[in-house]
Interface confidence: low
């Protein structure tokens, strides 16, 4: 339960582009693996997955949200790095790229960091940023998806994620929680919520809420480790559970809703 930079030469979680250390090669993106079993699921998964630009390790079907219905929380946890950072750098890793939980149920966004120098009171900061685009709507507009993919390919930047990479000025940004040493402090917006940073730097929600959908950035700040990118992100999506979910997620069974 201890308090808990990205590899140089990789795309970081802030949309700041690529920076290359002369001695570090480019990293190959993690390949996508398809887990669905029917054509309808495959179409939905392809739509959703394609826009993740190689960041997922599992596919995911989805269904339009319906107000007032049960909900399923789909958490896409995307690693922003696959490389080892150079000497005296922080390497932040967001692992376990796919979670499914029920609304109001707990979820943990795993984040760990490694520091090449003595870990002297690094500060762990989890920030929330709203999506740059409506991910759910796009997942069910194949033409729009195709247009996006074509635009990405034409631009020669297949790693671009339109849901994550935009200026902070056009979306909501909040500090969720910070941890320094033994102490965890919640951001103003999250006061009263049962949220904490556990493990190395994992963000744990005792109960998820509709407003939790968005992109969560795990950042580790240290005065000693100045090189490398110190950030990775996870996408958290809250979707309505309808009868269609069983079709889109074969084998998925939703548990009871808890208040």
């Amino acid at each position: 339960m201890q308090q808990d930079g990205l590899g140089v030469g990789t795309r970081n979680g802030s949309g700041k582009g690529r920076s290359v250390h002369p001695s570090w090669p480019w990293c190959a993106p993690r390949p996508l693996r398809y887990f669905g079993r029917d054509a309808r699921a495959r179409r939905a998964q392809t739509a959703a997955m394609a826009l993740l630009a190689g960041g997922l390790s599992r596919g995911l079907g989805s269904h339009p949200a319906a107000a007032g219905r049960d909900a399923v929380v789909f958490v896409w946890l995307l690693l922003s790095t696959w490389c080892t950072a150079p000497a005296r750098a922080i390497q932040v890793t967001v692992s376990n790229p796919y979670h499914v939980v029920i609304l109001f149920q707990p979820v943990t966004l795993p984040c760990t960091y490694q520091m090449t120098s003595t870990p002297t009171q690094p500060i762990v900061i989890w920030k929330y940023k709203s999506f740059c685009r409506d991910r759910i709507a796009d997942a069910f507009s194949p033409a729009s998806v195709d247009n996006q993919l074509n635009a990405q390919l034409a631009a020669g930047n297949p790693g671009y994620n339109p849901y994550v990479e935009c200026q902070d000025s056009v979306r909501t940004v909040r500090v969720v929680a910070t941890k320094q040493g033994n102490a965890v402090t919640l951001g103003d917006y999250y006061q009263g919520r049962r949220i904490t940073i556990t493990g190395n730097a994992d963000l744990t929600f005792d109960q998820t809420a509709w407003g939790d959908s968005g992109v969560y950035y795990c950042s580790v700040v240290s005065a000693q480790d100045l090189q490398g990118n110190n950030e990775a992100y996870a996408e958290l999506i809250v979707l309505g559970r309808t009868s269609g979910v069983a079709e889109l997620l074969p084998g998925f069974q939703a548990g009871p809703i808890e208040d």
Partner: antibody, heavy 114, light 106 residues
Framework: AVTLDESGGGLQTPGGALSLVCKAS????????MQWVRQAPGKGLEWVTG????????RYGSAVKGRATISRDNGQSTVRLQLNNLRAEDTGTYYC????????WGHGTEVTVS | ALTQPASVSANPGETVKITCSGG????????YGWYQQKSPGSAPVTVI????QRPSDIPSRFSGSTSGSTATLTITGVQVEDEAVYIC?????????FGAGTTLTV
């Protein structure tokens, strides 16, 4: 000043149960993980269990796993250790401690299982 | 368990170093604390936590450092009142672990 006051110790019977309570003051209780550490007479420190700031994450040492339950009440700034099926080897002084790399300790409460 | 010397001795004013090894990394990093116990059964006092952080009421002659999986407690200009047992502790994936303690004789 940070203070941690343990209570609930005393003479216990084998097979019975005990409930220890740690009352904290002087800091933002919900921001800190809390631990229980014990020390048998003439022995070293032994980690018993720990709980995260929100109470959502708990861990237990191998000697008490399955017998111990740690919980906390952030409103009351208390952390509780429930230990069941007591054994003679549970005898010792139980300390409440703040943080995972501990930065503050209580004075301890003595438990004797006999 | 953590490994530390059973005892060390020093004269007042000397510098003492106590090492602690055998800890496992916790999610890729090592986290150590040092705890002073002046008599058996008395409550420990933290002199170093989080590898090198010193509580505000602990004298500056106490310092901590880590190199890999080994932690070192350094007492610069040791004083008679520093005579005690010093116990190292760490936090691993499975939970907390302590060393058997090092008796410092001044």
């Amino acid at each position: 000043a940070v203070t941690l006051d343990e209570s609930g110790g005393g003479l216990q019977t084998p097979g019975g149960a005990l409930s220890l309570v740690c009352k904290a003051s002087g800091f933002d209780f919900s921001s800190y993980e809390m631990q229980w550490v014990r020390q048998a007479p003439g022995k070293g420190l032994e980690w018993v269990t720990g709980i995260s700031g929100s109470g959502s994450s708990t861990r237990y040492g191998s000697a008490v796993k399955g017998r111990a339950t740690i919980s906390r009440d952030n409103g009351q700034s208390t952390v509780r250790l429930q230990l069941n099926n007591l054994r003679a080897e549970d005898t010792g002084t139980y300390y409440c401690a703040r943080g995972s790399t501990i930065d503050a300790w209580g004075h301890g409460t003595e438990v004797t299982v006999s | 368990a953590l490994t530390q010397p059973a005892s060390v001795s020093a004269n007042p004013g000397e510098t003492v170093k106590i090492t602690c090894s055998g800890g496992s990394s916790y999610a890729g990093s090592y986290y150590y604390g040092w705890y002073q116990q002046k008599s058996p059964g008395s409550a420990p006092v933290t002199v170093i936590y989080y590898n090198d952080q010193r509580p505000s009421d602990i004298p500056s002659r106490f310092s901590g450092s880590t190199s890999g999986s080994t932690a070192t407690l350094t007492i610069t200009g040791v004083q008679v009142e520093d005579e005690a047992v010093y116990i190292c502790g760490t936090y691993e994936d499975s939970g907390g672990v302590f060393g058997a303690g090092t008796t410092l004789t001044v």
